[in-house]
Amino acid sequence: WSSKVLMSSANEDIKADLILTSTAPEHLSAPTLPLPEVQCFVFNIEYMNCTWNSSSEPQATNLTLHYRYKVSDNNTFQECSHYLFSKEITSGCQIQKEDIQLYQTFVVQLQDPQKPQRRAVQKLNLQNLVIPRAPENLTLSNLSESQLELRWKSRHIKERCLQYLVQYRSNRDRSWTELIVNHEPRFSLPSVDELKRYTFRVRSRYNPICGSSQQWSKWSQPVHWGSHTVEENPSLFALEA
């Protein structure tokens, strides 16, 4: 026994909107079109967006999203109370902070209300899906004549839960120097050249103590230190993402 899936070979490895031509064993009902995948991210532990590609539906369909946690007093699914829309069709759900339980298995069900048998249930570890806000309030101070310290702040998330990526370069550098800083929102550069102008920026992720998120935050606003007179090639300051 085997099943067939029609898909374009160019996207063989990642094509998600599959067309089922035969279905699982002992299922005698007519095959149904698979639903789009739901992707969830928890933004700074303030709210969560669970979204799907509504344009993958052959006809405009207002899919519904229900969710629950694996271990909870009320084990029934609750429907999304704040849908996100794309071209007037549901394409996501925003879940507020009080409904987020980072360390319980999150169970999410997407369903076609016109065809109740068309449903998909996914399970997610939310602690691996946290995206922090960009670090803020970057400040530079001189620890000594040639030593600089960079400090920053992160809102709403405990510092010990975050890992930081610091990038810096001088106006003489063509590429960034980068390093990982764990849990401490500070970094010191032991030797700086006062004739150069330095640019620093930082981003963070929820890893590895409290979660295993691979997603970095956006970059902080850059901060600068040093001479403003030696800018040989201003184009070097274009910050690539």
């Epitope: 099943s3 698979p34 995948e37 169970v107 996914q122 399970k123 691996n128």
Partner: nanobody, 126 residues
């Protein structure tokens, strides 16, 4: 055409162990959500263990702590290590695959899987 072939089933005593294997041919499993499901006579099919290609794995409550899902992408194979087997684990065990875009997708709904194996019988006697 994708083929999933399970093996490793058999007749064992309660408390024994078995390791099921599922080998895929025709495409790589490296970007597939995978699932092990089982169907006992007169019962609904249920998921046993499901896994995203990013590595998140979830187990049905009754097997948590006894069964372990693993995958070997180099061999295009997934495994289900079953320890401390009980008579109620008796069923036909199926391996299923769903190509996915996202590393975090793990499906517990059987109709989300595109590819299925033919099943392997596991019988646990008391």
């Amino acid at each position: 055409e994708v083929q999933l072939v399970e093996s490793g089933g058999g007749l064992v005593q309660a408390g024994d162990s078995l390791r099921l294997s599922c080998v895929a041919s025709g495409r790589t499993l490296s970007r597939c959500a995978m699932g092990w499901f089982r169907k006992a006579p007169g019962k609904e099919r249920e998921y046993v263990a499901i896994s995203s290609w990013g590595g998140d794995t979830f187990y049905e409550d009754s097997v948590e702590g006894r069964f372990t899902f693993s995958r070997d992408n180099a061999k295009n194979t997934v495994y289900l290590q079953m320890n401390s087997l009980r008579p109620e684990d008796t069923a036909v065990y199926y391996c299923a695959a769903a190509p996915t875009s996202f590393a975090t997708t793990a499906y517990s709904s059987s109709n989300s899987y595109a590819y299925w194996g033919q099943g392997t019988q596991v019988t646990v006697s008391s």
